[in-house]
C-alpha cells in the first residue's frame, strides 16, 4: 500500500494506491483512492506513467479529458465515473500489454487540496493449471497444463503423502510458445504416481503463483486449483 500526501501551499489530501499485476491481453485495474469531495466538478484525476510524456488518463469536470493522452493508451483507459465522487480514482486498463509495466502516478486535485501516490504495475501472463490423470501413459502419470504464462515460470510438484520429496527426477516440464509469440503453454508430467494420494502442481513466476491439486483414490478423482497474485502492496 502506498499512501501519498499533497504538496505544500494548498492543503494536502491522502491518496492511496495498491501495487498490482496485469494479465496481458486481458483488462486490468490500477487501484487508487482519495479523500472524497462533495462536488464532482471540483475533482481532477490524472494518471501518469514514468517515462511516458503524454498522460495515461485525465478526468476533470465530471468527464474524461483526453486531449493530452499518450498514443500508447489510446482507447484503452477509463475511470469508474460514478465512483469518483466517493473517492475512487481507479483506472481500468483494457487489453493489457507487456509494455504497460512500470511506475504509475495517481494525481488528485480536489477543493480540499492536492495529493498523489505511485503504483508499481507488473505485466505478464498467468492462468489456472489443470491436473489430469494421463491414461495414455504406460504407468500412472499426471499431466498438469496451464495455457498462458509469461515470463517463463518454475514448476514444482508436491505430494501430501511424501511431504518434502523432490519430484524433479520423476517429472518433465515443457514450455510451448503460443501463437502470439509472447506467452507460453506450460505442460508438466509427473510419473510413477501412487494411488490414495493428493498431488500438487505449483507454477510460479514473479507475478503470480498458481496451484493445481488432484486427489486420486480407487473410487474417485478430485481436482482443485487456485491462483494468487504476488507483491500486491499498497502505497
Amino acid at each position: 500500500l502506498i499512501i501519498g500526501f499533497g504538496i505544500s501551499g494548498r492543503h494536502s489530501i491522502t491518496v492511496t494506491t495498491v501495487a498490482s499485476a496485469g494479465n496481458i491481453g486481458e483488462d486490468g485495474i490500477l487501484s487508487c483512492t482519495f479523500e472524497p469531495d462533495i462536488k464532482l466538478s471540483d475533482i481532477v484525476i490524472q494518471w501518469l506513467k514514468e517515462g511516458v510524456l503524454g498522460l495515461v488518463h485525465e478526468f476533470k469536470e465530471g468527464k474524461d479529458e483526453l486531449s493530452e493522452q499518450d498514443e500508447m493508451f489510446r482507447g484503452r483507459t477509463a475511470v469508474f465515473a460514478d465512483q469518483v465522487i466517493v473517492g475512487n480514482a481507479s483506472l481500468r486498463l483494457k487489453n493489457v500489454q507487456l509494455t504497460d509495466a512500470g511506475t504509475y502516478k495517481c494525481y488528485i486535485i480536489t477543493s480540499k487540496g492536492k495529493g498523489n501516490a505511485n503504483l508499481e504495475y507488473k505485466t505478464g501472463a498467468f492462468s489456472m493449471p489443470e491436473v489430469n490423470v494421463d491414461y495414455n501413459a504406460s504407468s500412472e502419470t499426471l499431466r498438469c497444463e496451464a495455457p498462458r504464462w509469461f515470463p517463463q515460470p518454475t514448476v514444482v510438484w508436491a505430494s501430501q503423502v511424501d511431504q518434502g520429496a523432490n519430484f524433479s527426477e520423476v517429472s518433465n516440464t515443457s514450455f510451448e510458445l503460443n501463437s502470439e509469440n509472447v506467452t507460453m503453454k506450460v505442460v508438466s508430467v509427473l510419473y510413477n504416481v501412487t494411488i490414495n494420494n493428493t498431488y500438487s502442481c505449483m507454477i510460479e513466476n514473479d507475478i503470480a503463483k498458481a496451484t493445481g491439486d488432484i486427489k486420486v483414490t480407487e473410487s474417485e478423482i478430485k481436482r482443485r486449483s487456485h491462483l494468487q497474485l504476488l507483491n500486491s502492496k499498497a502505497s
Partner: antibody, heavy 116, light 107 residues
Framework: QVQLVQSGAEVKKPGASVKVSCKAS????????MNWVRQAPGQGLEWMGR????????NYAQKFQGRVTLTVDTSTSTAYMELSSLRSEDTAVYYC?????????WGQGTTVTVSS | DIQMTQSPSSLSASVGDRVTITCRAS??????LNWYQQKPGKAPKLLIY???RLHSGVPSRFSGSGSGTDYTLTISSLQPEDFATYFC?????????FGQGTKLEIK
C-alpha cells in the same frame, strides 16, 4: 518563452549523412517529446519520427527506419536528427517540433540540399 | 498509416469572407485533429488542436469542428494576414500524417 533554434543550412553529396540540431529553451526539455518533420520544396509536411528526451526512446516512420537516428543531449537541451545515405529526394527543410498529439512549437527549419 | 485528405487544395477569397477547409481521415481519429498555418519561408504555426481547441494567441475568428473521420477549419472573417497555406494533421496514432495543404489566396 518556448524557443526551438535549429542549426544552419547544409549542402551534402548523395550518399553522405547530415546531422541537424535543435536547441530548446523556455521549458523543461525532458517534459515533452521532440518530433522531426520535413518539407520538400513546394510539398506537404512529412513526419519522420520523435524522441523522448526523458529516456532517449524513439519512434520512427517506417519510411525512414534504419536511415534516421534521433538523439538528445539533456545537458544542453538539444535534440539531434541524423539522416544517412542521402539522396536528391531528401532535399527539404527539416523542422523540429515539440509535444505529442500535436506540435505546439516549431524550430525555424534547416534547409538540407543534396546535390552532386 | 492513416491517410488525410484535405479539400480544397486551393481557394481564392476576399478579406471579410467566411472560409471553410475540410479534412477527411481514412479512419476514425477520435478528435485528434490539428490545424496549422504556414506562410512562405516560415515554419508552420499551430492554430487548433484536438478538433476545436484554440492554441494560445490564436484569434477567435479561427474555429474547428468535426468528429470521427470528418473535420472542418473555419475562418469567420478573413483578415489580410490569413492568406497562407493550411495543413491538417492527425495525432491519433503514430506516424503522424498531414493533409496535403490548402493554399488560401486573395481573390
Amino acid at each position: 518563452q518556448v524557443q526551438l533554434v535549429q542549426s544552419g543550412a547544409e549542402v551534402k553529396k548523395p550518399g553522405a549523412s547530415v546531422k541537424v540540431s535543435c536547441k530548446a529553451s523556455g521549458y523543461t526539455f525532458t517534459d515533452y517529446y521532440m518530433n522531426w518533420v520535413r518539407q520538400a520544396p513546394g510539398q506537404g509536411l512529412e513526419w519522420m519520427g520523435r524522441v523522448n528526451p526523458a529516456n532517449g526512446g524513439t519512434n520512427y516512420a517506417q519510411k525512414f527506419q534504419g536511415r534516421v537516428t534521433l538523439t538528445v543531449d539533456t545537458s544542453t537541451s538539444t535534440a539531434y536528427m541524423e539522416l544517412s545515405s542521402l539522396r536528391s529526394e531528401d532535399t527539404a527543410v527539416y523542422y523540429c517540433a515539440r509535444r505529442h498529439n500535436y506540435a505546439d512549437f516549431w524550430g525555424q527549419g534547416t534547409t538540407v540540399t543534396v546535390s552532386s | 498509416d492513416i491517410q488525410m485528405t484535405q479539400s480544397p487544395s486551393s481557394l481564392s477569397a476576399s478579406v471579410g469572407d467566411r472560409v471553410t477547409i475540410t479534412c477527411r481521415a481514412s479512419q476514425d481519429i477520435s478528435n485528434y485533429l490539428n490545424w496549422y498555418q504556414q506562410k512562405p519561408g516560415k515554419a508552420p504555426k499551430l492554430l487548433i488542436y484536438y478538433t476545436s481547441r484554440l492554441h494560445s494567441g490564436v484569434p477567435s475568428r479561427f474555429s474547428g469542428s468535426g468528429s470521427g473521420t470528418d473535420y472542418t477549419l473555419t475562418i469567420s472573417s478573413l483578415q489580410p494576414e490569413d492568406f497562407a497555406t493550411y495543413f491538417c494533421q492527425q495525432g491519433q496514432t503514430l506516424p503522424w500524417t498531414f493533409g496535403q495543404g490548402t493554399k488560401l489566396e486573395i481573390k
